[in-house]
Interface confidence: low
């Protein structure tokens, strides 16, 4: 008999277009489907109603899109999540699922023209109002400006209805004002629980004429390094010329909030041709602490403070580099990007994430599975290396230890970490599995990703699997759904997937097949894989001078800019003196910050796979419900469960 199934995101968002996938497996002829969305638990309101027909021509697969309106049923009540009932009627067969609703309407990105202001000056700021697809939306936004004590000093309710997704705003800072870090907080009126913010500094300052950069040769200090910590001081005028002057440099140890200065480390060094070098010797470091045991310093960090004075004495700039960790290994291994579950008897793809001590990704670090050194790989630019190991067909948990294999490091200096992977549970302990794998490359829009569908199953039933259904989740929505055909005898099938800007910043590919197993019961077999995409602009934008290269802009005169971008796009500009960033580099709105916010709002919760077919769907942010009784557990929380510390 046919199996009817519905798949939706396991969080549906108000006022957002959502997609639902409908399928009829082993069906004959046309199957009419009516989809209705009701309030829960009352079922008093029809929030949306759609109709479609699943036909043999479309392989009995289709989708409907619907939008849940923001009516008063969904007004936020503290501590109470809202749900809807999604119901699909296939002919006369009803399949329904209760789905969690998010009141979050989209994102707000706040940009100030500068990072630091003097009392009495004006803060120019703007708020980008976008939906989950990062397209402009017109909605009411609440804005607060808070002083360093967290007290709101200005509150506004603004509509971005006619602003094409940008609210241009300003605030005059009083002459008498609290110095320190101020905050702009904003949220959509419909979703007050989702607050977006940025900070700016208020301080009396004079713009410097040059910039000082303090850069250690390594991002960490290896505690047994006899050479000590080498640091380069670079000083340049803001227009590019190299500084000649003198630097006074002092080192110190930071332990949480506490700072211990190392007076013996104070040095006066010449800055010639824009740079100078200084070394904190290991002896000075150890002599500077009581009971100097090198091991006691591990886990603490070093800071370097440099004050550069021009030979003329006309200007002086102070700079600091802090948070240089004291370590026993220059690397850390993380399994945050590795699935927690494996399919027995199939490859297990370890996505080993290696970081430098400051948390940044470590590039070109060899890693290997301990005891299986033929399985070795190098980390890429994002710090991730893929290691595939062959697993045993037994249902035992796997304990896997990964080590770095950096030639310059001794065995003691290599980083090592162990993880445990659990076996995926099949329905009725069958031997039916699906493994999705992709090549580890830095994936960019415009490229094609080959997704491998690897099948392992009882040979007697193998011919029954004629297709896989695959679904792509991105930014909390079902971006794409399709079928991958499989011929009898094919263990490996490859799906070429064209990557577009829609796939940024990452996506999850979920696939499954269904069959009547040896026991006569309907079985669903699923897997998923999380894929990172290189963050880049969705549109194109180039800003350049509109004047010929030989005509340098002169103070007090006009200059022209040439802006190239997508037709119909709205462009907003900001001009700022570079000297501002010498004083404060924090809180700039960057592309990577935008993608980080989007990534954090992902409704999927793991790097792939799951404890069973239902876990695969749930962990990827999907619900699965069928007429044969298979279904995912009810998602009750908007946040992903936090792993135990």
């Amino acid at each position: 008999s046919p199996m009817y199934s519905i798949i939706t995101p396991n969080i549906l968002r108000l006022e957002s277009e959502e997609t639902m996938v409908l399928e009829a497996h082993d069906a004959q002829g046309d199957v009419p489907v009516t989809v209705t969305v009701h309030d829960f638990p009352g079922k008093k309101l029809v929030l949306s109603s759609e109709k479609t027909v699943l036909t043999p021509a479309t392989n009995h697969m289709g989708n409907v899109t619907f939008t849940i309106p923001a009516n008063r049923e969904f007004k936020s009540e503290k501590g109470r999540n809202k749900f809807v009932t999604v119901q699909a009627t296939f002919g006369t067969q009803v399949v329904e699922k209760v789905v969690l609703v998010s009141l979050q309407s989209g994102y707000l990105f706040i940009q100030t023209d500068k990072t630091i202001y003097t009392p009495g000056s004006t803060v120019l700021y703007r708020i980008f109002t976008v939906n989950h697809k990062l397209l402009p939306v017109g909605r009411t936004v609440m804005v607060n400006i808070e002083n360093p004590e967290g007290i709101p000093v200005k509150q506004d309710s603004l509509s971005s209805q006619n602003q094409l997704g940008v609210l241009p705003l300003s605030w005059d800072i009083p002459e008498l004002v609290n110095m320190g870090q101020w905050k702009i907080r904003a949220y959509y009126e419909n979703s007050p629980q989702q607050v977006f913010s940025t900070e700016f500094e208020v301080k009396e300052y004079v713009l410097p004429s040059f910039e000082v950069i303090v850069e250690p040769t390594e991002k960490f200090y290896y505690i047994y390094n006899e050479k000590g910590l080498e640091v380069t001081i670079t000083a340049r005028f803001l227009y590019g010329k190299k500084v000649e002057g003198t630097a006074f440099v002092i080192f110190g140890i930071q332990d949480g909030e506490q700072r211990i200065s190392l007076p013996e480390s104070l040095k006066r060094i010449p800055i010639e041709d824009g740079s100078g070098e200084v070394v904190l010797s290991r002896k000075v470091l150890l002599d500077g602490v009581q009971n100097p045991r090198a091991e006691d310093l591990v886990g603490k960090s070093l800071y370097v403070s440099a004050t550069v004075i021009l030979h003329s004495g006309s200007d002086m700039v102070q700079a600091e580099r802090s948070g240089i960790p004291i370590v026993t290994s220059p690397y850390q291994i993380h399994f945050t990007k590795t699935p927690k579950y494996f399919k027995p008897g199939m490859p297990f793809d370890l996505m080993v994430f290696v970081t430098n001590p400051d948390g940044s990704p470590a590039y070109r670090v060899p890693v290997a599975v301990q005891g299986e050194d033929t399985v070795q790989s190098l980390t890429q630019g994002d710090g991730v290396a893929k290691l595939s190991i062959n697993t045993h067909p037994s249902q035992k948990p796997l304990s896997i230890t990964v080590r770095t294999k950096k030639q310059e490091l001794s065995e003691a200096e290599q980083a090592t970490r162990t993880m445990q992977a659990l076996p995926y549970s099949t329905v009725g302990n069958s031997n039916n599995y699906l493994h999705l794998s992709v090549l580890r490359t830095e994936l960019r829009p415009g490229e094609t990703l080959n997704v491998n569908f690897l099948l392992r199953m009882d040979r007697a039933h193998e011919a029954k699997i004629r297709y896989y259904t695959y679904l792509i989740m991105n930014k909390g929505r079902l971006l794409k759904a399709g079928r991958q055909v499989r011929e009898p005898g094919q263990d490996l099938v490859v799906l070429p997937l064209s990557i577009t800007t829609d796939f940024i910043p990452s996506f999850r590919l979920v696939a499954y097949y269904t069959l009547i197993g040896a026991s006569g019961q309907r079985e669903v077999v699923a897997d998923s894989v999380w894929v990172d995409v290189k963050d880049s602009c969705v549109g194109s934008l180039v800003v350049k001078s509109g004047q010929s290269e030989d005509r340098q802009p002169v103070p007090g005169q006009q200059m022209t800019l040439k802006i190239e971008g997508d037709h119909g796009a709205r462009v907003v500009l900001v001009a700022v003196d570079k000297g501002v960033f010498v004083l404060n580099k924090k809180n700039k709105l960057t592309q990577s910050k935008i993608w980080d916010v989007v990534e954090k709002a992902d409704i999927g919760c793991t790097p792939g796979s799951g404890k069973d077919y239902a876990g695969v769907f749930s962990d990827a942010g999907l619900t699965f419900t069928s007429s044969s009784g298979q279904q995912t557990a009810q998602r009750a929380e908007l946040q992903c469960p936090q792993p135990a510390a």
Partner: antibody, heavy 119, light 112 residues
């Protein structure tokens, strides 16, 4: 009954190519990685390379470029393609299954196929 | 570089015991190794997997007379109550960074 049988050996002139086959039974290549190992007359065992489940390969440094391992899962057969053969490639060539995920032992082995390279 | 060193030959009398040694390069002394047997004109056969702490797992059909032990970088294969069919080449092997590595092998002669 788990079995590994090599074939395709013989005499060949230097500079020529030869493809060896390794037919497996009693298990699926879909679940296990396979190794090729050789043994020159009167000498010890020398590892050539491995093909993992899913087709990934790894070779001994000396074998890279001249030797290629591939599989045909539907035929349950592993191949070793040897190009630009030299006299020092004269040896018995063994195929062995890799078992275990932490440290893959080679078990079982075939009984080898003999290759002679001479003019 | 990962190297496994075996003495080229060993001999012992029928019914006696013999202990074959495989030494790992010092940087790799924690590695698990495998022992293989190759009887004259026969195919190689897996005997056991031996860990650094001395525990071992034998292959199917390997007699109880074969056992393994470890000390530091050294891995031992002990054969007690020697029989004529134990006369063979014995190889140790392990997975290294560049792939699988074999020791040079030890030729065991069973006397009289």
């Amino acid at each position: 009954q788990v079995q590994v049988v090599e074939s395709g050996g013989g005499s060949v002139q230097p500079g020529r190519s030869l493809r060896l086959s390794c037919a497996v039974s009693g298990f699926s290549l879909y679940n296990y990685a396979m190794n090729w190992v050789r043994q020159a007359p009167g000498k010890g065992l020398e590892w050539i390379g491995i093909i993992n489940v899913g087709g990934g390969t790894n070779y001994a440094s000396w074998a890279k470029g001249r030797f290629t391992i591939s599989t045909d899962n539907s035929k349950n057969t592993v191949y070793l393609q040897m190009n630009s053969l030299r006299a020092e490639d004269t040896a018995s060539y063994y195929c062995a299954r890799a078992v275990g995920y932490h440290h893959a032992r080679l078990d079982p082995w075939g009984c080898g196929t003999s290759v002679t390279v001479s003019s | 570089q990962l190297v496994l060193t075996q003495s080229p030959s060993a001999s012992a009398s029928l019914g006696a015991s013999v202990k074959l040694t495989c030494t790992l390069s010092s940087a790799h002394k924690t590695y698990t190794i495998d022992w293989y047997q190759q009887q004259p004109e026969k195919c190689p056969r897996y005997l056991m997997q031996l860990k650094s702490e001395g525990s071992y797992t034998k292959g199917t059909g390997v007699p109880d007379r074969f056992s393994g032990s470890s000390s530091g970088a050294e891995r031992y294969l002990t054969i007690s109550s020697l029989q004529s069919e134990d006369e063979a080449d014995y190889y140790c092997g392990t997975e290294g960074v560049g792939g699988y590595v074999f020791g040079g092998g030890t030729k065991l002669t069973v006397l009289g």
